[in-house]
């Protein structure tokens, strides 16, 4: 199965809005999507969100900080394909995030 294709849809100083897509023929096999994220440089802890939809907003994040985000499709049989590990950055308080 093809891995989810992930996009950054929007961001603020404390949140990242992430969406993803998979080919329609595969969608019926997916039960939920698991979004794993952590601060870049912090390999000791990570957060997990599960959703049935194709998007999620990650809240309570630190400003001007890069997060590693990966989306995994979950099927009834177990874990499906996982996306690339993406790096998304929240805005800085001055709104000058590059």
């Amino acid at each position: 199965t093809e891995p989810p294709k992930v996009r950054l849809e929007g961001r603020s100083t404390t949140s990242l809005s992430v969406s993803w897509s998979i080919p329609p023929p595969q969608q019926s096999r997916v039960w939920k999507y698991e979004v794993t994220y952590r601060k870049k440089g912090d390999s000791n802890s990570y957060n997990v969100r599960r959703t049935e939809g194709f998007s999620v907003t990650l809240d309570d994040l630190a400003p001007d900080t890069t997060y590693l985000v990966q989306v995994q499709a979950l099927t009834q049989e177990g874990q499906g394909a996982g996306s690339k590990v993406h790096e998304f950055q929240t805005l800085s308080p001055e709104g000058s995030g590059n």
Epitope: K40, K84, L91, N98
Partner: antibody, heavy 130, light 108 residues
Framework: QVQLQQWGAGLLKPSETLSLTCAVY????????WSWIRQPPGKGLEWIGE??????????NYNPSLKSRVTISVDTSKNQFSLKLSSVTAADTAVYYC?????????????????????WGQGTMVTVAS | SYVLTQPPSVSVAPGQTARITCGGN??????VHWYQQKPGQAPVLVVY???DRPSGIPERFSGSNSGNTATLTISRVEAGDEADYYC???????????FGGGTKLTVL
Amino acid sequence: QVQLQQWGAGLLKPSETLSLTCAVYGGSFSGYYWSWIRQPPGKGLEWIGEINHRGSINYNNYNPSLKSRVTISVDTSKNQFSLKLSSVTAADTAVYYCAKPLRPHCINGVCYSGDAFDIWGQGTMVTVAS
Amino acid sequence: SYVLTQPPSVSVAPGQTARITCGGNNIGYKNVHWYQQKPGQAPVLVVYDDSDRPSGIPERFSGSNSGNTATLTISRVEAGDEADYYCQVWDHSSDHVVFGGGTKLTVL
């Protein structure tokens, strides 16, 4: 088209400090992570480290195997970045390259750590011998 | 730290297809970049982000990446393709660039 031109001493004695500089011509300097990479004779490529200047802060990242001996610095007024490697030994004999990543580090919140290197310096052969 | 494994050498006849592999744990989750290096020259980027080509690189060069193996494919191989080829990734665990050991492509 961006070009990288590098220079520095090519012959060192053991325990001395290697010093190389790379000048960036024809393109943007800020926003990129600029890297140094080396290649011992007949061997593969080894990443040394990188530097990014954002705002008034330098962000450095070094290969753990060399971290204790490496310093990468930047002179934004000249669009140059430099490598210093202390306490060299014969094992540091190599061709040293500076390199530019394909994309700025972050574009609209999407970041590219470890991006592909699309522009390389001409290389500087550094020999360490007593 | 993260390790990328390449075969030391690959041989192919002119006009045939060469496949150079780059193995790493769950490498499919990473973006893989490929370089060509000829003797006495700096490396040249031939494929980035698994399968994209920089401008000026022939369509004969293509890439794929899945599971634990990334592959650089060179179709209709020419004598001028003889070179060393290196793969590269970013290791998110250690936050540094990792290169494969390199593969010498010989055109018979």
